[in-house]
Every structure is written in structure tokens, then in C-alpha cells.
């Protein structure tokens, strides 16, 4: 199963950690896909490491663990984020996070 904080908030100009937790006694994570709506943010592969989409490469840092640190947030980053865990032999699991970027006080 996937466990996430379903709703998170952060300040404009700040950073936020996008994190999904996968728990299974038998399945091994082989790949994790991160998307902002339908746009690819990053992919983690147990065999190849991290691929960060070039459009986000200056603002997205892998980690902690299989999560992402999203930096220099703008109001346009408000929206849905999806993690997709590819596991073997367990199949595919998806998680959803809604990020609200608030104006800095």
C-alpha cells in the first residue's frame, strides 16, 4: 500500500518534500515515477538511478529516500502530484498529494 500526506502546503519561494511511503513484506520497489499533473518530474530506477526532467532540473532534488525535494516554489506549482511505485512481484501502486503554494507572509 501507499501512504502519503494527502494535502500539504508550503510558502512561495520555499521548498517542500514530496514523499510517498510504500509498505510491503514481499514486493521490491523497482521504479518510482513522480508527476506533476501529467508532466513528468522525475523517475527513480533501482538499476539506473535518478532521472530528473530537464524542465525541473534546477528546482527538483532527489530525496530524501524515494521522495523529491521541490525548491523555489511558485504559485503555479499548486496542484496534484502523483507517485507511481512499480514493484516486483506486487505490481503498480499509486499515491496522490495535493500541494498548495501560499503567498509568503
Amino acid at each position: 500500500t501507499i501512504d502519503t500526506k494527502r494535502n500539504i502546503s508550503a510558502e512561495e519561494g520555499g521548498s517542500v518534500i514530496l514523499q510517498c511511503h510504500f509498505s510491503s513484506d514481499t514486493a521490491e520497489v523497482t521504479q518510482v515515477d513522480w508527476k506533476q499533473q501529467d508532466q513528468l518530474l522525475a523517475i527513480y530506477s533501482v538499476d539506473l538511478g535518478w532521472h530528473v526532467a530537464s524542465v525541473f532540473s534546477d528546482r527538483v532534488v532527489p530525496g530524501p529516500s524515494l521522495g523529491l525535494t521541490f525548491q523555489s516554489l511558485t504559485m503555479n506549482d499548486t496542484g496534484e502530484y502523483f507517485c507511481t511505485y512499480h514493484t516486483y512481484p506486487g505490481g503498480i501502486y499509486k499515491g496522490r498529494i495535493f500541494l498548495k503554494v501560499q503567498e509568503s507572509s
Partner: antibody, heavy 119, light 107 residues
Framework: QVQLVESGGGLVQPGRSLRLSCAAS????????MHWVRQAPGKGLEWVSG????????GYADSVKGRFTISRDNAKNSLYLQMNSLRAEDTALYYC????????????WGQGTMVTVSS | DIQLTQSPSSVSASVGDRVTITCRAS??????LAWYQQKPGKAPKLLIY???SLQSGVPSRFSGSGSGTDFTLTISSLQPEDFATYYC?????????FGGGTKVEIK
């Protein structure tokens, strides 16, 4: 024993294409990611491309992106590198390599196949 | 892309010497660093993976350390068969990248 044998190299003119093959034996090919690494004469190692076991994720060096395509046929225990729009700077010995599973060090290498791009 | 800077680019040493080669990454790569040995006309040989894990069959005089951006390969007592070129390689980010190499020569 675990073995990787590259083929398909040769002399080719700039702008032309070449397809390299790597035949794997002695291990369960379909369980492993695979890689191509090259070495220009007298120069260092350059990672070219890598592909996961199921082709779910593929990576390329910036120097070959858009020109080279890595692929694999698990039924044939074979890895391929399609090289288009070849340039003089692609001249190198091309190695096929297998990683330590999940640990990403390249522990088995082929003998290499030489690609020479020249008019 | 991650740049790996190896130093020195070459080193002259004698049998029995302790040799240290460093590899610095342009960004943090956790412990996803490997070290290879290459002799003329031969394919590279994996020595160390995961920054510090010794590959099976590699002599214990080879050791690796470091994490983040700074890594070290140490040969505790150089043997005649160790004269070769050594490369570091990162596997944290795609594209993977190699360092420029360090040639260990006989003094």
C-alpha cells in the same frame, strides 16, 4: 561463464548509421539492466547509454542523445545500439557491460567493438 | 549532468607505496560511486561499488571511502600489477558519468 560479445563495428562515413549488437550468455539476461560504454583512442571512459531489464527507463549521454538508440531483445539475450548521424568524435571502442544487480557497478564487460567514423 | 573530477591525473609511485586517488562530484551522489582499474588493451575491471564495497576477487589492499561529493580510492601497498589507469563513475543520476582517469605509473 558470464560472457558479453559485441559485434557490428567498422569503418563508416560521417552522417551514416551503424548498429552494434551485444550477445549475452552465462546469466539470466532478462533480469539485468545493460549498458554501453565507449572509449576513444587514447582517451578515458565515457558512458553512452543504459536500459532497464524491461526497457522501462532508458538513459543517454548528452553527446549521443537524439542520435543513438539503445534497445534489447530478452528472448534473444541481445543488446543493441543503433547509431545514426555518426560524427568523427564517435570514433571509439564500444563496450557492452552488465551491472552488479541493484548496486550499479559494471562487473562484466565485453571485449569491445571498434567504430571508426571517417571519410 | 554530474561532473566527476579526479586528482591527480597521474601519479608516479614505487612498489610498496600507499597511493590515494580522489574523485569529487559536482553534486551530491550519496554513495553511488564505483571505481575501475584499466590496463592497456583491456576492458575495465570493477574494483569498488557503493563507494566502499569491495568487488568479489579484488585484493583487500584496495579500499574506497566517502559519500556525498568527496570520494577516495586507496591502494595500501602498491603491487607491480597495480600500475594501470583508475576511473571513478557515478550512478546516482542519469546520465551516468566517469571521471577523467588517474594513471598510476612506475617511479
Amino acid at each position: 561463464q558470464v560472457q558479453l560479445v559485441e559485434s557490428g563495428g567498422g569503418l563508416v562515413q560521417p552522417g551514416r548509421s551503424l548498429r552494434l549488437s551485444c550477445a549475452a550468455s552465462g546469466f539470466t539476461f532478462r533480469d539485468y539492466a545493460m549498458h554501453w560504454v565507449r572509449q576513444a583512442p587514447g582517451k578515458g571512459l565515457e558512458w553512452v547509454s543504459g536500459i532497464t531489464w524491461n526497457s522501462g527507463l532508458i538513459g543517454y549521454a548528452d553527446s549521443v542523445k537524439g542520435r543513438f538508440t539503445i534497445s534489447r531483445d530478452n528472448a534473444k539475450n541481445s543488446l543493441y545500439l543503433q547509431m545514426n548521424s555518426l560524427r568523427a568524435e564517435d570514433t571509439a571502442l564500444y563496450y557492452c557491460a552488465k551491472p552488479v544487480p541493484r548496486l550499479r557497478g559494471l562487473d562484466v564487460w565485453g571485449q569491445g567493438t571498434m567504430v571508426t567514423v571517417s571519410s | 549532468d554530474i561532473q566527476l573530477t579526479q586528482s591527480p591525473s597521474s601519479v608516479s609511485a614505487s612498489v610498496g607505496d600507499r597511493v590515494t586517488i580522489t574523485c569529487r562530484a559536482s553534486q551530491g551522489i550519496s554513495s553511488w560511486l564505483a571505481w575501475y582499474q584499466q590496463k592497456p588493451g583491456k576492458a575495465p575491471k570493477l574494483l569498488i561499488y557503493g563507494a566502499s564495497s569491495l568487488q568479489s576477487g579484488v585484493p583487500s589492499r584496495f579500499s574506497g571511502s566517502g559519500s556525498g561529493t568527496d570520494f577516495t580510492l586507496t591502494i595500501s601497498s602498491l603491487q607491480p600489477e597495480d600500475f594501470a589507469t583508475y576511473y571513478c563513475q557515478q550512478a546516482f543520476y542519469l546520465p551516468w558519468t566517469f571521471g577523467g582517469g588517474t594513471k598510476v605509473e612506475i617511479k
